[in-house]
């Protein structure tokens, strides 16, 4: 059964997923998708990393932690009720049937209060590591659509970032974790 995580409408949701790289910088590809983990890949992929970097993401989805140290926890910005559901974190360990997969259930609750406006910050400055994408799009149209419309001034609030980083520490022990090597 899926581990359940909760967030309120308008907040950033946090879905923990971790692995321990065999050696520093020896990264393993990871994908995140909407929907339970299928036999391969991550259903409708919303974000993925390769051996070096985040190489595909869609708007509102990012990695707030240090993915180079194995923190591949997913942050979903400014969630709505439509973001409820199961998400898949898949750690694509090379070899014969070595993948580790985790299903995480996100429950979105209506907001209790309307949050006051907060200062905005440039997405590129906050997350410079995410400025790489796969070199070409899909040969045919996939269910998810084509490459995301990447807006380099996507907004993230300082308050949400601070809360997410505290939450990351709180949930590290309860999140999906796998040691490699």
């Amino acid at each position: 059964s899926e581990v359940e995580y909760r967030a309120e409408v308008g907040q950033n949701a946090y879905l923990p997923c971790f692995y321990t790289p065999a050696a520093p910088g020896n990264l393993v590809p990871v994908c995140w998708g909407k929907g339970a983990c299928p036999v391969f890949e991550c259903g409708n992929v919303v974000l993925r990393t390769d051996e070096r970097d985040v190489n595909y993401w869609t708007s509102r989805y990012w990695l707030n932690g240090d993915f180079r140290k194995g923190d591949v926890s997913l942050t979903i910005e400014n969630v709505t009720l439509a973001d409820s559901g199961i998400y898949c974190c898949r750690i694509q360990i090379p070899g014969i049937m070595n993948d580790e997969k985790f299903n995480l259930k996100l429950v979105i609750k209506p907001a209790k209060v309307t949050p006051a406006p907060t200062r905005q910050r440039d997405f590129t400055a906050a997350f410079p590591r995410m400025l790489t994408t796969r070199g070409h799009g899909p040969a045919e149209t996939q269910t998810l659509g084509s490459l995301p419309d990447i807006n380099l001034t996507q907004i993230s609030t300082l308050a949400n970032e601070l809360r997410d980083s505290r939450l990351a520490n709180d949930l590290r022990d309860s999140g999906a974790t796998i040691r490699i090597g």
Partner: antibody, heavy 122, light 107 residues
Framework: EVKLVESGGGLVQPGGSLRLSCAAS????????MAWVRQAPGKGLEWVAN????????YYLDSLKSRFTISRDNAKNSLYLQMNSLKAEDTAVYYC???????????????WGQGTLVTVSS | DIQMTQSPSSLSASVGDRVTITCRAS??????LAWYQQKPGKAPQLLVY???TLAEGVPSRFSGSGSGTDFTLTISSLQPEDFATYYC?????????FGQGTKLEIK
């Protein structure tokens, strides 16, 4: 136009080996998982193996993984199946099929080759 | 392993009939189900993926539905070229597994 063309089938004695090939064209080969599926004469479909985009991860039917090896060469747009220690029950038409793509979403074998017949008999 | 059970195993129908084939999974496979059509001596052809999405080029008389463990393939008005064998297949658990097939014959 997407095309998958298998080759390498034929008659082989029990205990022998064969290497099947599948030449792919009409799509970005390295963007897709690829698979082998087989069908014994008059029987249903049976999945054999899958391989991820760059060949670093492979997946097999448990009963076959000690004898069969799936691999790919993205530079040549080719998929392979090395079959060792063949048995009479491995007799089947072997199909190469394109599986899920880099962005997920479409879970089904969208394109198939015409198949190549492997007959294991003495 | 996830077992896929199709029913019926064979079916006789006439051109113009509405036909439904069912597929039951032994475990929850969410919507990771595909349907294929196969004619004698030919490779299978994908009809439906993700339980209900029609593959490119497939006539709209075909439709898929269901999620979890119970799925159906419906042909709203049979055409002469639809007489073939139909297979369901799950993409949720390893190993990937197919149903045993449903042979659709002319009445």
């Amino acid at each position: 136009e997407v095309k998958l063309v298998e080759s390498g089938g034929g008659l082989v004695q029990p205990g022998g080996s064969l290497r099947l090939s599948c030449a792919a064209s009409g799509f970005t080969f390295s963007d897709y998982y690829m698979a082998w599926v087989r069908q014994a004469p008059g029987k249903g479909l049976e999945w054999v193996a899958n391989i991820n985009y760059d060949g670093s991860s492979t997946y097999y039917l448990d009963s076959l993984k000690s004898r069969f090896t799936i691999s790919r060469d993205n530079a040549k747009n080719s998929l392979y199946l090395q079959m060792n220690s063949l048995k009479a029950e491995d007799t089947a038409v072997y199909y190469c099929a394109r599986d899920v793509g880099y962005y997920g979403g479409n879970y089904g074998f969208a394109y198939w080759g015409q198949g190549t017949l492997v007959t294991v008999s003495s | 392993d996830i077992q896929m059970t199709q029913s019926p195993s064979s079916l006789s129908a006439s051109v113009g009939d509405r036909v439904t084939i069912t597929c039951r999974a032994s475990d929850n496979i969410y919507s990771y189900l595909a349907w294929y059509q196969q004619k004698p001596g030919k490779a299978p052809q994908l009809l439906v993926y993700n339980a209900k999405t029609l593959a490119e080029g497939v006539p709209s008389r075909f439709s898929g539905s269901g999620s979890g463990t119970d799925f159906t393939l419906t042909i709203s008005s049979l055409q002469p070229e639809d007489f073939a064998t139909y297979y369901c297949q799950q993409h949720y658990g390893s190993p990937l597994t197919f149903g045993q097939g449903t042979k659709l014959e002319i009445k």
